[in-house]
């Protein structure tokens, strides 16, 4: 067992080294380890094959370090890995697209608060078992086409607190099992009419605190399972162009937030849902 760590066998074979001031991944981690806790240290780099000997590893926590670089092959050989927490590493900024390849059993991936500015092509390729993906509180500006395409079992996608300005047509392709999509506190001004086409199982959609002045009801039409919708704190324009959204909200059987109008001035602060159809005039 490495000097700064505690190793024990129950309930699982564990190497635990949190908050020890470690500046590198320690050598001598027992190969039988099923859980490795390295959070709260000063580790800045995860070299290639850092955990290659740990073939039984299911949980790896590297959150709250000062990671600036993760070699593309850092997690090579971890075919049984189920939980990977890399959150709270604000200097990371980017992740090589090959980093997570081969992690076919991964079901939870934390990449929140990592200073990420973009999601490289193929970053999540092959993560067919992934259920929870935490990408909130980064600096993401765009959602590239087909980024999440292989994530057919993903149920929770956390994208809030970024700088995303639009939701393009193919941003959420392949997310057939998605239950919760949190996009609040971004800069979303435009949602493509077909952006949510694959989200037939979505139950919760948070779009509050964005820059939406309108939302095409065509985008909401595929959301057959939707139960919870939050649209507040957007600059909604409640003129004739809002009539389709107004009509959709009247028929929506789930629960939705207030949808306060910003314009026209005579309707500012009024809830779109509570307006009459003839209030929505002038274009």
């Amino acid at each position: 067992c490495p000097g700064a760590c505690v190793c024990y066998n129950e309930p699982k074979v564990t190497t635990s080294c949190p908050q020890q001031g470690l500046q590198a991944v320690p050598v001598g981690i027992p190969a039988a380890s099923q859980r490795i806790f390295l959070h709260g240290n000063r580790i800045s780099h995860v070299p290639a094959a850092s955990f290659r000997a740990c073939r039984n590893l299911t949980i790896l926590w590297l959150h709250s370090n000062v990671l600036a670089r993760i070699d593309a092959a850092a997690f090579t050989g971890l075919a049984l890995l189920e939980q990977l927490d890399l959150s709270d590493n604000a200097q990371l900024r980017s992740v090589d697209p090959a980093t997570f390849h081969g992690l076919g059993r991964l079901h939870t991936l934390h990449l929140d608060r990592c200073g990420l500015q973009e999601l490289g092509p193929g970053l999540f390729r092959g993560l067919a078992a992934l259920q929870y993906l935490y990408l909130q509180d980064n600096a993401l500006q765009a959602l590239p086409d087909d980024t999440f395409r292989d994530l057919g079992n993903l149920t929770h996608l956390f994208l809030h607190g970024n700088r995303i300005s639009s939701v393009p047509e193919r941003a959420f392709r392949g997310l057939h099992s998605l239950d919760r999509l949190l996009l609040h506190q971004n800069r979303v001004a435009h949602v493509h009419p077909h952006a949510f086409r694959d989200l037939g199982r979505l139950m919760t959609l948070y779009l509050f605190a964005n820059n939406l002045s309108a939302l095409p009801t065509e985008a909401l039409a595929p959301l057959r399972a939707l139960q919870y919708l939050r649209l507040n704190d957007n600059p909604w324009v409640c003129d004739c162009r809002a009539r389709p959204l107004w009509a959709w909200l009247q028929k929506f059987r789930g629960s939705s937030s207030e949808v306060p109008c910003s314009l026209p001035q005579r309707l500012a602060g009024r809830d779109l849902k509570r307006l009459a159809a003839n209030d929505l005039q002038g274009c």
């Epitope: 919760r180 506190q185 139950m203 605190a209 629960s255």
Partner: antibody, heavy 116, light 108 residues
Framework: QVQLQQSGPGLVKPSETLSLTCTVS????????WSWVRQPPGKTLEWIGY???????KYNPSLKSRVTISADTSKNQFSLKLSSVTAADTAVYYC??????????WGQGTMVTVSS | QSVLTQPPSVSVAAGQTARITCGEA??????VHWYQRRPGQAPLMVIY???ARRSGIPERFSGSNSGDTATLTISRVEAGDEADYYC???????????FGGGTKVTVL
Amino acid sequence: QVQLQQSGPGLVKPSETLSLTCTVSGDSITSYYWSWVRQPPGKTLEWIGYIFDTRTTKYNPSLKSRVTISADTSKNQFSLKLSSVTAADTAVYYCARDAGTIFDYWGQGTMVTVSS
Amino acid sequence: QSVLTQPPSVSVAAGQTARITCGEANIGRRSVHWYQRRPGQAPLMVIYYDTARRSGIPERFSGSNSGDTATLTISRVEAGDEADYYCQAWDFSSDHPVFGGGTKVTVL
């Protein structure tokens, strides 16, 4: 590290206005939501309201007629005013950063007693 | 306004497992967050979005949420875990956050 520091009197007379201020360091009040939450003795936590983007406010319907939350960006602080207080408003009052759905950072709390 | 249903108290021997429930119809369809409040201190978020553990919170703390019950589980309970625990969710009928009544955890 985000820190919230509360200030304000611990004793308010009935029918007067309770005033508390929360000064934020480590974050800008132009980001996130900023809430007030209270806990009367022997009761649970109760959300009072929030301010967002320094001008949009939302209040608990049960308190709406008496509550005002405002922000001062130059001092990076936000404030609570609760008018016409009664003994039922005696509580520990907390300010908190509200990440839209979760309260991830809290002030230290201020015990406010309403009594003549 | 609705308050989520929690047991007022849970007693557990040191080293054992404490389970704190938070109930409401179909709560499993909503996101639940958990806070720990030690005497004289401000609440501390420990679990968010049902299962996510806040940085710095020991792995002994875990959350789950399905059906009509969300659960905070504290395994291998220590004396320092003695505190009040509150669940919280968004109440869509009133369109604002609501808390559970709180559960006092006593370590025997």
